[in-house]
């Protein structure tokens, strides 16, 4: 008889999850020489150990520490790019500007990007049927806790001038409840981070508003300034330029600025 399985509101674990994580790890370590020492089987074991056999609404940041330790990586100063509600464009940017890095350009972020996973209490099985939804079920689920953990670490290790890409088409350009607003902003280290520069990306072709004057940006400026980090904001009006460069990655002048 099939075991009774908890029904959650969210979609289940991504199919072929273990194989995907392992394959991504191998690919990443092949492409990034500085991570060649990483043993991908150990990485998978640590990843699995964070959520397998555990009640999926009771996951802690502590559960992910062995994985975080294995995936330790540093970004050069001035090269960290955070983002909020504009992931695809941020990734297009770092695809071209290869010396800047989002969390998903780092090993752990790369492994988990766009994946869902959870297990069940007291069984070694992965739940492919359903996983807890952050709103409807619980916030301490395996996926949410993972991103909170690695986002915190990513922000803590940033140094120099940190950039953040924000979506100017949203009603809340800066959202205190986003991962950026609730985790990363509060974990930038004032002794290491000189400044946060926000890039507000405009959507409309004819848009010529100054979105750096938006009340939510003023709120972000206030939070950052209180943490003794300087704040700058720039309006960015032509996001289609990112894709034009991505389409022609062989064009070295796209990569270097000019």
């Amino acid at each position: 008889l099939p075991r009774w399985r908890q029904q959650w509101s969210g979609s289940g674990t991504t199919s072929r999850f273990p194989e995907t994580v392992l394959a991504r790890c191998v690919k990443y370590t092949e492409v990034h020489p500085e991570m060649r020492h990483v043993d991908c089987q150990s990485v998978w074991d640590a990843f699995k150990g964070a959520f397998i056999s555990k009640y999926p609404c009771n996951i802690t940041e502590e559960d992910y520490q062995p994985l975080v330790k294995l995936g330790t990586q540093t970004v050069p100063c001035n090269k960290t790019l955070l983002w909020s509600r504009i992931k695809d464009l941020a990734h297009q940017f770092t695809q071209v500007q290869r010396d800047m890095f989002t969390l998903e350009d780092m090993l752990l972020g790369y492994l988990a990007d766009d994946l869902t996973w959870c297990g069940e209490f007291n069984t070694f099985e992965i739940n492919y049927q359903s996983c807890p939804d952050w709103r409807k079920d619980c916030s301490n689920n395996p996926v949410s806790v993972f991103w909170k953990t690695v986002s915190r670490r990513f922000a803590e290790t940033a140094c120099g001038v940190v950039h953040v890409m924000l979506n100017g088409s949203r009603s809340k350009i800066f959202d205190k409840n986003s991962t950026f607003g609730s985790v990363e902003v509060h974990n930038l280290q004032p002794e290491k981070v000189q400044a946060l520069e926000a890039w507000v990306i405009h959507g409309g072709r004819e848009d010529s508003r100054d979105l750096c004057q938006d009340p939510t940006i003023k709120e972000l400026e206030s939070i950052i300034s209180k943490r003794n980090i300087r704040f700058f904001c720039k309006n960015i009006y032509r996001p289609d330029k990112f894709l034009q460069c991505v389409k022609n990655p062989e064009d070295s002048s796209c990569l270097s600025g000019i």
């Epitope: 004819e206 848009d207 009006y237 032509r238 460069c245 002048s253």
Partner: antibody, heavy 120, light 107 residues
Framework: QVQLVESGGGLVQPGGSLRLSCAAS????????MNWVRQAPGKGLEWVSG????????YYADSVKGRFTISRDNSKNTLYLQMNSLRAEDTAVYYC?????????????WGQGTLVTVSS | DIELTQPPSVSVAPGQTARISCSGD??????VYWYQQKPGQAPVLVIY???KRPSGIPERFSGSNSGNTATLTISGTQAEDEADYYC??????????FGGGTKVEIK
């Protein structure tokens, strides 16, 4: 290396038309916004028009809107400016300029310019 | 539309520092670009993104942008720096604007 060479300038009567061309080489033409910037004799720089790489987006300064048309042929690596209903105040050296990539909107490279004189 | 205001001329002794200002409403919210133009020649980009120097531009050229004013600084000016300098910004849509230009004279 990047090269931009303008052509098509000359003397034209008020109300007349002229088509400027800019031949580009040394970079992937379709990756970049391209622009026309002009400079009247003894005056400063004035942006005239810009076009995206694909080329779905075009932009015009108010002073030329409805009279000038920017276009490009990516297969020929060539930028164009069709100028109609020309006025004396359109007299200037017209420069073709390549935009900077990504978050920057300035001009990395300029041609040597072509002179347009509108006079009767 | 933003309007960029530059002083018509700046005079400086050789080896001294020349500072050219460019002012406009909330200019700090926009990237600023600086061009050098010598008589009979096309403009040359000397600073982009407020403070970045293109390859081939001497280190004596630097830029900053805060409040309502962007500044181009030429440290240890040389005779070859005598030229017109233009600031430029982009504020979306069809609002790409240049300042009126500043003539730098080496005394």
């Amino acid at each position: 290396q990047v090269q931009l060479v303008e052509s098509g300038g000359g003397l034209v009567q008020p109300g007349g038309s002229l088509r400027l061309s800019c031949a580009a080489s040394g970079f992937t033409f379709s990756s970049y916004y391209m622009n026309w910037v002009r400079q009247a004799p003894g005056k400063g720089l004035e942006w005239v028009s810009g076009i995206s790489g694909d080329p779905s987006n075009t932009y015009y300064a108010d002073s030329v809107k409805g009279r000038f048309t920017i276009s490009r042929d990516n297969s020929k690596n060539t930028l164009y400016l069709q100028m109609n209903s020309l006025r004396a105040e359109d007299t200037a050296v017209y420069y073709c300029a390549r935009d900077l990539p990504l978050v920057y909107t300035g001009f990395a490279y300029w041609g040597q310019g072509t002179l347009v004189t509108v006079s009767s | 539309d933003i309007e960029l205001t530059q002083p018509p001329s700046v005079s400086v002794a050789p080896g001294q520092t020349a500072r050219i200002s460019c002012s406009g409403d909330n200019l700090r919210h926009y990237y600023v670009y600086w061009y050098q133009q010598k008589p009979g020649q096309a403009p040359v980009l000397v600073i982009y993104g407020d403070s970045k120097r293109p390859s081939g531009i001497p280190e004596r050229f630097s830029g900053s942008n805060s409040g309502n004013t962007a500044t181009l600084t030429i440290s240890g000016t040389q005779a070859e720096d005598e030229a017109d300098y233009y600031c430029q910004t982009y504020t979306g849509g069809a609002s790409l604007v240049f300042g009126g230009g500043t003539k730098v004279e080496i005394k």
